[in-house]
Amino acid sequence: VTGSRVYPANEVTLLDSRSVQGELGWIASPLEGGWEEVSIMDEKNTPIRTYQVCNVMEPSQNNWLRTDWITREGAQRVYIEIKFTLRDCNSLPGVMGTCKETFNLYYYESDNDKERFIRENQFVKIDTIAADESFTQVDIGDRIMKLNTEIRDVGPLSKKGFYLAFQDVGACIALVSVRVFYKKCPLTVRNLAQFPDTITGADTSSLVEVRGSCVNNSEEKDVPKMYCGADGEWLVPIGNCLCNAGHEERSGECQACKIGYYKALSTDATCAKCPPHSYSVWEGATSCTCDRGFFRADNDAASMPCTRPPSAPLNLISNVNETSVNLEWSSPQNTGGRQDISYNVVCKKCGAGDPSKCRPCGSGVHYTPQQNGLKTTKVSITDLLAHTNYTFEIWAVNGVSKYNPSPDQSVSVTVTTNQAAPSSIALVQAKEVTRYSVALAWLEPDRPNGVILEYEVKYYEKDQNERSYRIVRTAARNTDIKGLNPLTSYVFHVRARTAAGYGDFSEPLEVTTNTVPSRIIGDGANST
């Protein structure tokens, strides 16, 4: 029975005489008068078995002690650690010619674990062992036994096991402990690759190449390799593994992303929080599920927020010019969180008696610049039929519109084509300008071409460049535009509408709001 003693992780003990409970029972030659098994107390008052010999008075000593058979366990090189005490010959009277201060260490490889006799000629010498510290009679009196530790190695070994032997040639010696071990590079994980226990090579300079295996939930990026050095240390890690999608490195292993996190690819990145408007309900998510009403386009990365279709375009205005219609609108209030917004135009030809009976306009109608995928907020439609009701729908679309098409994404206008809409208004004037308002007035168009039903004023801040405009409608030839910002340049356009539709807008009138009230007359082009 052996008791366990703690040694370095890179050493595997094959024999430890101090761990043996009871007699060691090694073979001595001669059987008597040479090596003798003696029980002594160690530094912790634990009994340990030792072998002693002290035939220093007699010449030509040749006392052999052989261990039991020691299994090799696949090791090619083993290490022998001997702890011993040795008496100083100078401290012994009358032994000058016969006392020695060394002993010899031998080994013999064998597949036979039950060899009963010592055959000296079978053994190969490892080394002569000398003491760094020898002790005298004074040391014995003081109970100071000077313990020597010597380590030798032997290899390459090839048979199943071996025997060790100690040859005494006339020393006063006590073998306190004998430990035989080999070195291994212990199981380790590096770069998410596991490297197994690996026995070191046959010679003291050899490196054993070992291929690692990726830990659970990981895959090879480059082949993971390490070298096991002769001292039992791992050297030169090469290559690595990466945690699979849905997993991240944590304490040398690949663990599933937590709920609410995801990882789309096998990379060395950590899991990321689900992007806006998405979630994950399981551990180990490789992508996150979009919230209800939100979507991902086919080419959207997993890291992109989920988005939704845009709302309808705003402020759709039409301008009928005989059998042509110009449509203009503003961007939707909500783009759905995407930049890839475009517009499609749907044209329907409707019966005069029953506006609900509408049919597609057909291929004879032409759109400038195009009917679908418009990037601008205006379109010109030509080659319509005269005196016909048309309904035009402007659809705002983005990369996810196809997943949830809804009428909420369009705005429509119904017009009647004619032979002549009113001409444009020649003169627009700013009658009064205050901090927050502008009073406008204008003349009737030169050619009304019918009864003027109303006027439409379009205005916007000059530096907004017509991107964000407002519309005011009035039956009179003047209006007060309120709610403006002080000291801000505004651009105004006015047009007239008859039953035939809208005329063209007037030339722009630019007005800057004041800090103090003033009464001025504009000239239709510029006013300050």
């Epitope: 944590r250 292993e253 663990q255 937590k258 709920i259 609410g260 950590t270 899991c271 990321a272 929080k273």
Partner: antibody, heavy 115, light 109 residues
Framework: QSLEESGGRLVTPGTPLTLTCTVS????????MSWVRQAPGKGLEWIGI?????NTYYANWAKGRFTISKTSTTVDLKITSPTTEDTATYFC????????????WGPGTLVTVSS | YVMMTQTPSSVSAAVGGTVTINCQAS????????LAWYQQKPGQRPKLLIY???TLASGVPSRFKGSGSGTEFTLTISDLECADAATYYC?????????FGGGTKVEIK
């Protein structure tokens, strides 16, 4: 779902002590488990964690002083060589699968180290 | 390894009042929001209040509010009740390590 620590007692310095956390209502193969301690009148201190896989990880200050292991229904904390500074209430706690933190705690067990 | 600095170490407030506890991390916590708040009363186990910096744990009254991101986090307790007298701890996670703040003892006057 509950946790119950046991094994806390008075020990002399240097005498190894093992605390046990018994789990019920969930599987240790699905959750990571941590140990946390609290010295009398002091704050909470995270010791270490045993992952579902059985691998362990310790706070820097705890390395070599504690060993965490588990069976199918228990998680053990071994205090390898207790000192008087290890006198504390020891809690085992379950790491959430939803967030990084502990969502279920045991009532704790008191360890007193004194000569 | 992340260090969590909690302030103040103690605070006293009246019933119906509001208490604010701060927790500062020495570096950004994992995901910028992996921070939890716990309440502990004498002789009892810690109780989870808030996780992921701002999500209220099940059964916790909405008087408890967590906020913050990265390195700065706050726990606010409004409409204080006598039952809120306890010590409150933040817990941060980063690079395999958990760290508790030093704790804030809340007394109710």
């Amino acid at each position: 779902q509950s946790l119950e620590e046991s094994g806390g007692r008075l020990v002399t310095p240097g005498t190894p002590l093992t605390l046990t956390c018994t789990v019920s209502g969930f599987s240790l193969s699905s959750y990571h488990m941590s140990w946390v301690r609290q010295a009398p009148g002091k704050g909470l201190e995270w010791i270490g964690i045993i992952y579902r896989s059985g691998n362990t990880y310790y706070a820097n200050w705890a390395k070599g002083r504690f060993t965490i292991s588990k069976t199918s229904t228990t998680v053990d904390l071994k205090i390898t060589s207790p000192t008087t500074e290890d006198t504390a209430t020891y809690f085992c706690a379950r790491e959430s699968s939803t967030f990084y933190g502990m969502d279920l705690w045991g009532p704790g067990t008191l360890v007193t180290v004194s000569s | 390894y992340v260090m969590m600095t909690q302030t103040p170490s103690s605070v006293s407030a009246a019933v119906g009042g509001t208490v604010t506890i701060n927790c500062q991390a020495s570096q950004s916590v994992y995901g910028n929001n992996e921070l939890a708040w716990y309440q502990q009363k004498p002789g009892q186990r810690p109780k989870l209040l808030i996780y992921r910096a701002s999500t209220l744990a099940s059964g916790v009254p909405s008087r408890f509010k967590g906020s913050g991101s990265g390195t700065e986090f706050t726990l606010t307790i409004s409409d204080l009740e006598c039952a809120d007298a306890a010590t409150y701890y933040c817990l941060g996670y980063k690079s395999d390590d958990y760290t508790f703040g030093g704790g804030t003892k809340v007394e109710i006057k």
